[in-house]
């Protein structure tokens, strides 16, 4: 079965800056990726970015830049300042819509013991929902 992995990294240079990386481990064709924080999108989570493989990218503050890393993985840089900035225990979620598998979502947060600039290797996070 497909899996989604999520990796969260705090930048050493800017302690309020985060990089979120997400990937889809499946054979299907990805049609949309939605990144949110504070929980799954549409279930209390706040939209950070939506990436379509053909049509483009849309992002929401405090996202600075979302991009495709490969055909099945994305990254998102968050710029933290003020009320909308993330904190160390913030949960980030990535939802991949693919054909024919459907939608797969996983969430992750900064590893508790991670030093700035370090992060755990990208491993599959628990799958929260498969539509």
């Amino acid at each position: 079965t497909p899996e989604v992995w999520v990796q969260v990294r705090m930048e050493a240079t800017e302690l309020s800056s985060f990089t979120i990386r997400c990937g889809f481990l499946g054979s299907g064709s990805i049609s949309l990726v939605t990144v949110s924080w504070g929980g799954p999108n549409g279930a209390g989570g706040t939209t950070l970015a939506v990436l379509h493989p053909e049509r483009g990218i849309r992002q929401w503050a405090p996202a600075r830049q979302a991009r495709w890393e490969t055909q099945s993985s994305i990254s998102l840089i968050l710029e933290g300042s003020g009320a909308s900035s993330p904190c160390a225990n913030t949960t980030f979620c990535c939802k991949f819509a693919s054909f024919p598998e459907g939608s797969w979502e996983a969430c992750g947060s900064l590893p508790p013991s991670s030093d700035p600039g370090l992060s755990a290797p990208p491993t599959p996070a628990p799958i929260l929902r498969a539509d």
């Epitope: 493989p53 483009g56 993985s73």
Partner: antibody
Amino acid sequence: QVQLVQSGAEVKKPGASVKVSCKASGYTFINNFIEWVRQAPGQGLEWMGVINPGSGDANYAQKFQGRVTMTRDTSISTAYMELSRLRSDDTAVYYCASHWLAYWGQGTTVTVSS
Amino acid sequence: EIVMTQSPPTLSLSPGERVTLSCRSSQSLLSSGNQKNYLSWYQQKPGQAPRLLIYGASTRETGIPARFSGSGSGTDFTLTISSLQPEDFAVYYCQNGHFYPYTFGGGTKLEIK
């Protein structure tokens, strides 16, 4: 079929606010974000911002920050764009669009004049 | 913000002719991770809303005639109409779909010679 129907033309005085509505039908409203684009008379297209109807999250072009508010009412599949502190150069046709700008409303003419 | 520059501003042509419209972005719109260019083209006729023609620099939107084609990569893009029909005389806009804010070009007006 997908349809976006916007509210009617408005005439406003400088300093006032205007709220334009965009009623969506033919698709699941919360599954596609709505973008707003305006066009001043004889000018080109200007991207104003985007709202995710599912969560209500909005992001605005820097130029409009502090003056524009995008909201939605999921119960009636309608998105709204409110622009405050209107100036004469806000006179334009305001469009809503969905599905990555594949579908557009008919446009709402907003005239700002004293 | 990304600046989208279209040229020429106006073009006078006759039906049946082939036309190439140009759009240049101030920053590359190529997504290196998946090798896609996030550039769209729109057509707008007087008194009407814009109509999406091309997305991803070269993919025709559903229902768009085959005479419309898009090409280019990085910062330089073109929209080609292989044989102009009377209904093609309109204003054409390109749009950056990669970087916030998602700016449009100033447009190219196609008028009948």
